[in-house]
């Protein structure tokens, strides 16, 4: 940009150097050159000479007018054609920007990843503003009324050390740029309700050599939370449809889950957990790939006919990936297919 130009005159922009995208804009150039009575004043945008909508106002001043200016940034400068000079003479230059006032931040979410020592808040910023936009996160104790503010760009991590005064907070985000300000909706946060258990990891899997082979998946977490509810999803690598099993887990020991799967197939497993009764899930664990062994005896394969797991399995459902490029985003394909015992299966968050 043109930030350190030595001007021989002035350049100014109406309505201002930063303006709302789509507005009509006038840019003025006023020369103050010594020993020059310019024949012409010229405007350049991003180095290219402009030909249209230029008005000579008087001997020293010209204006260029843009209808519905919609470029996020432009570098403007103007020059003078002085008699007796072979080259044009620079008068002045300006960086101009157009953009939008911010949208109100939406989908504000705050979580505490176990052992992180931080409350992490994220939000949707809305449509691009094209100009520098700041986010101010307000955290107000509902018990002491004390309010803290944090500057952020797209998320914020707030040390839980600074949240020791109380457990209940009101959190909201202000989006601010030179064209306006908008507030998110306020989020009521109870620190005890937003903890996400330490990451769950699938450590290994093995398929037994029995007449009806079974696959045992071993998985663990370092969480100290006693009551944890987990989902494991699995599918063949060639399939779009995930099956999902639900578990009540106790991570004082390694979890073992048994599956009766198709032989000689490559399966992908992922697991995620939440504190029982809470709403925030871990992200799905890294995909764990396991190849089942070849079928030994000849028999009709009925993958849904056998018991699924010796551990308390609540439900098995199927979900389908929306596209092979977005395996994390799932939607429910069918109702519960298998139910070991009554449960309040809840899948609105899958993916």
């Amino acid at each position: 940009g043109i930030t350190s130009i030595n001007c021989s005159g002035d350049m100014w922009v109406e309505p201002g150097e930063i303006f709302q995208m789509g507005m009509n804009v006038s840019i003025y150039c006023q020369e103050a050159l010594k020993h020059c009575r310019p024949r012409n004043l010229y405007f350049y945008k991003n180095g290219f000479k402009e030909e249209f909508d230029i008005t000579r106002i008087n001997r020293t001043t010209a204006r260029i007018w843009y209808k519905g200016f919609s470029e996020p940034h432009a570098y403007m400068h103007c020059t003078a054609e002085c008699p007796g000079h072979f080259q044009e003479t620079l008068i002045c230059g300006k960086d101009i920007s157009s953009g939008h006032p911010p949208d109100a931040p939406s989908n504000l979410t705050c979580v505490i990843y176990e052992y992180s020592g931080n409350m992490t808040c994220t939000w949707n910023t809305g449509k691009p503003t094209y100009i520098d936009t700041k986010y101010i996160v307000h955290v107000k104790s509902l018990e002491t009324e004390e309010e803290q503010q944090y500057l952020a760009s797209s998320y914020v991590k707030i040390s839980t050390d600074s949240l020791q005064g109380s457990r209940k907070y009101l959190v909201w985000v202000q989006a601010v740029n030179s064209l306006g300000m908008e507030n998110s909706q306020q989020l009521h946060v109870h620190l005890d309700d937003i903890v996400i258990p330490s990451a769950s990891i699938i450590s290994r899997a093995e398929t037994t050599n029995d007449t009806v082979p079974k696959t045992i998946v071993y998985w663990k977490s370092k969480t100290m939370i006693e009551k944890v509810f987990c989902e494991m999803r699995y599918k063949t690598t060639t399939n779009q449809t995930w099956s999902v099993k639900e578990f009540d887990a106790n991570f004082t020991y390694v979890q073992q889950s048994e599956f009766y799967l198709e032989p000689d197939s490559k399966y992908v497993f992922q697991v995620r957990c939440q504190e029982t009764g809470k709403r925030n899930w871990q992200p799905w664990s890294s995909p764990f790939v396991h190849q089942t062994s070849q079928e030994t005896g000849k028999r009709n394969w009925q993958p849904w006919s056998s018991p699924f797991v010796h551990q308390t399995s609540q439900t098995v459902s199927q979900v389908t990936a929306k596209s092979s490029h977005e395996p994390q985003k799932m939607e429910m394909l069918s109702a519960t297919i298998f139910r070991g015992h009554p449960a309040s299966g809840n899948h609105q968050d899958i993916g």
Partner: nanobody, 116 residues
Amino acid sequence: QVQLQESGGGSVQAGGSLRLSCAASGYTYSSCTMGWYRQAPGKERELVSMLISDGSTFYADSVKGRFTFSQENAKNTVYLQMNSLKPEDTAMYFCGCATLGSRTVWGQGTQVTVSS
């Protein structure tokens, strides 16, 4: 840690002017996003003006065209020029230093009272 000290408040008639100053000391000043805030009795603290980036300043709708934010880097000082003051501008005015991811630091504030 940056320390902030406001000055320039006082009592003025409606239509009058005041210029608030905020002097910053401490090594983190250069990384601050500086702002002016105000808090009227019984109300939440609100953002009045903030320096977003070079050549870009936010002004609350209620002060647009009347207040001007400026800074003097050599003196580590920011200013709020307040013209055409109204009774509803009466409040305690604070300057704040915000750095990414850190808690905003406030000055002690300076009182502005506008009488009709």
